[in-house]
Interface confidence: low
């Protein structure tokens, strides 16, 4: 808290202008209006304010504002939003993309920190939704912004967002993540044709069920080996040797490398042996010839 | 029987840099697992550092960590290693090597090695 | 971000006794919730994962329930061997996080 002072006679302040860098602390309070601050906060973006001076303008927004900042005030914060706690923001209503947009920029080179963390957050609950535009935003910001969602509040992003993410967006996703953001991905891209959509749908493989797996294996995709890895095993246990061979197209031949590990590994143990033969790979661990496949899911092979 | 044993604990200067080895024994490291780290200051609570997963290049790490601690991993040593620099005396603990089973039903730690002490001090 | 928060920090209970103790997430995991048990110079050891389920080899005397942001831990007709600090762990997202954990429960016998 900064003590009560009368202002100096003649440092009453009319304008928000550099002049007041060379106030003290309790002159900033004693001789700046806070309505005259709310309406010129635009300037202090302008002015090298020390951190210290800087408490004390927030501190008389705090003083006129107490129920929270309006967004006229909000969208011309600068550099003073660094000293917004989240507890001042989960009091703001923001709903302009614009004074999104403007915060986002003053925290621009950092890693997302708990304000910025609650702004999104107070932004996209007042939206009611992640909306194409608002994601747009966030992901140019924080690439990794997607990946940081809950599965549930990534069942609240519409399909329609979903044009806005880069493959480099979903690095950083889990498969849960994926199982939720695939389904809208499907629905975003459905309208496109073969060799359009494998591109667009490709980073979200790793939440495809096994029967759009199948489906693809229908259209030349060529998926690469990078792909293949990061199905959902359980996606891919149930492919056939022809459809995996479809699927792949010319990159069949890395399963040869990639025979130990998963999801290669346990889907050879699901095929029979003269089938994996055919792909003259030498892949090796399939179903001997002969037996009799009684129960897939057990993954048991008896003669 | 699979066990993990952690190595390279040591006393460290201030701003030095030290690498522990976490090494898989009985355990098909080309299987799909999360090898992680977690760490116990002496007194304190557990915390947890980074994953990275043994096939996949992916690795997560605690949002702390901005990039001291590198976490890698050789599959034909059947080992994940943890890089760490500009060590402080902050960093000194214990530290645990834990195997996840990548699987969709969540992080948990079935398998500790027995950890390893780091102490940072001049 | 996602915080645990455990409650309370120590405990004292009676042999034959019931011990509760609760773990709080700052945003809902589901189910994705481990407690594990940690004696002194030794590795945690997991008790329960998916809140609710008893890992292998663990005494039925641990019961874990909730989902969602609320969890409880009870041990039920409590042991000399129980004493030791009991910790729960998120496994929903590794996304953004500081850390897994919660911060400790002492349980002293």
């Known amino acids: 808290e900064v003590e009560k002072t009368a202002c100096p006679s003649g440092k009453k302040a009319r304008e928000i202008d550099e002049s007041l860098i060379f106030y003290k602390k309790w002159e900033l309070e004693a001789c700046v209006d806070a309505a005259l601050l709310a309406t010129q906060m635009d300037r202090v973006n302008a002015i090298p304010f020390t951190y210290e001076q800087l408490d004390v303008l927030k501190h008389k927004l705090d003083e006129l504002y107490p129920q929270g900042y309006p967004e006229s005030v909000i969208q011309h914060l600068g550099y003073l939003f660094l000293k917004m706690s989240p507890e001042d923001i989960r009091k703001w209503n923001v709903t302009s993309l614009e004074t999104l947009k403007a915060l986002l920029e003053v925290n621009k080179g950092h890693e997302m920190s708990p304000q910025v963390a609650t702004l999104i957050d107070r932004f996209v609950k007042g939206r009611g939704q992640l909306d194409k535009d608002t994601l747009d935003t966030l992901t140019a910001f924080y690439p990794g912004y997607l990946c940081s969602l809950s599965p549930e509040e990534l069942s609240s992003v519409p399909p329609s967002s979903i044009w806005a993410v880069r493959p480099q967006d979903l690095d950083t996703c889990d498969p849960r993540q994926l199982d939720v953001l695939y389904p809208k991905a499907r629905l975003a891209f459905q309208n496109m044709n073969g060799s359009e959509y494998f591109v667009k749908i490709q980073s979200f493989l790793g939440g495809a069920p096994t029967e759009d797996l199948k489906a693809l294996s229908q259209q030349n995709v060529s998926m690469d080996l990078a792909t293949f890895m990061k199905l959902r095993t359980d996606a891919v246990l149930p492919l056939t040797v022809a459809e995996v061979q479809k699927l792949l197209g010319p990159h069949v031949e890395g399963l040869k490398a990639e025979e130990r590990h998963r999801p290669v590994r346990d889907w050879i143990l699901r095929q029979r042996q003269d089938d994996l033969d055919t792909l003259g790979l030498g892949l090796q661990g399939g179903i001997p010839n002969g037996y009799l496949v009684l129960d897939l899911s057990m993954q048991e092979a008896l003669s | 029987q699979e066990q993990l044993e952690e190595s390279g604990g040591d006393l460290v200067q201030p701003e030095g840099s030290l690498t522990l080895t976490c090494k898989a024994s009985?355990?098909?490291?080309?299987?799909?697992?999360?090898i992680c780290w977690v760490r116990q200051a002496p007194g304190k609570g557990l915390e947890w550092i980074g994953c990275r997963h043994t096939f996949t290049a992916n690795t997560w790490s605690a949002s702390w960590v901005n990039g001291r601690f590198t976490i890698s991993r050789s599959t034909s040593l059947g080992t994940v290693d943890l890089k760490m620099t500009s060590l402080t005396a902050a960093d000194t603990a214990t530290y645990f090597c834990?195997?996840?089973?990548?699987?969709?039903?969540?992080?948990?730690?079935?398998?500790w090695g027995p950890g390893t002490l780091v102490t940072v001090s001049s | 971000a996602y915080d645990m928060t455990q409650t309370p920090a120590s405990v004292s209970a009676a042999v034959g006794g019931t011990v509760t103790i609760k773990c709080q997430a700052s945003?809902?995991?589901?189910?994705?919730l481990a407690w594990y048990q940690q004696k002194p110079g030794q590795p945690p050891k997991l008790l329960i994962y998916q809140a609710s389920t008893l890992a292998p080899g663990v005494s039925s005397r641990f019961k874990g329930s909730g989902s969602g942001t609320e969890f409880t831990l009870t041990i039920s007709g409590v042991e000399c061997a129980d004493a030791a600090t009991y910790y729960c762990q998120q496994g929903y997202t590794s996304s953004n996080v500081e850390n897994v954990f919660g911060g400790g429960t002492g349980v002293v016998v």
């Open positions: 945003q809902s995991i589901s189910n994705y």
């Open positions: 009985g355990l098909d490291f080309s299987s799909s697992y999360w």
């Open positions: 834990a195997r996840d089973e990548s699987n969709n039903d969540g992080w948990d730690f079935k398998l």
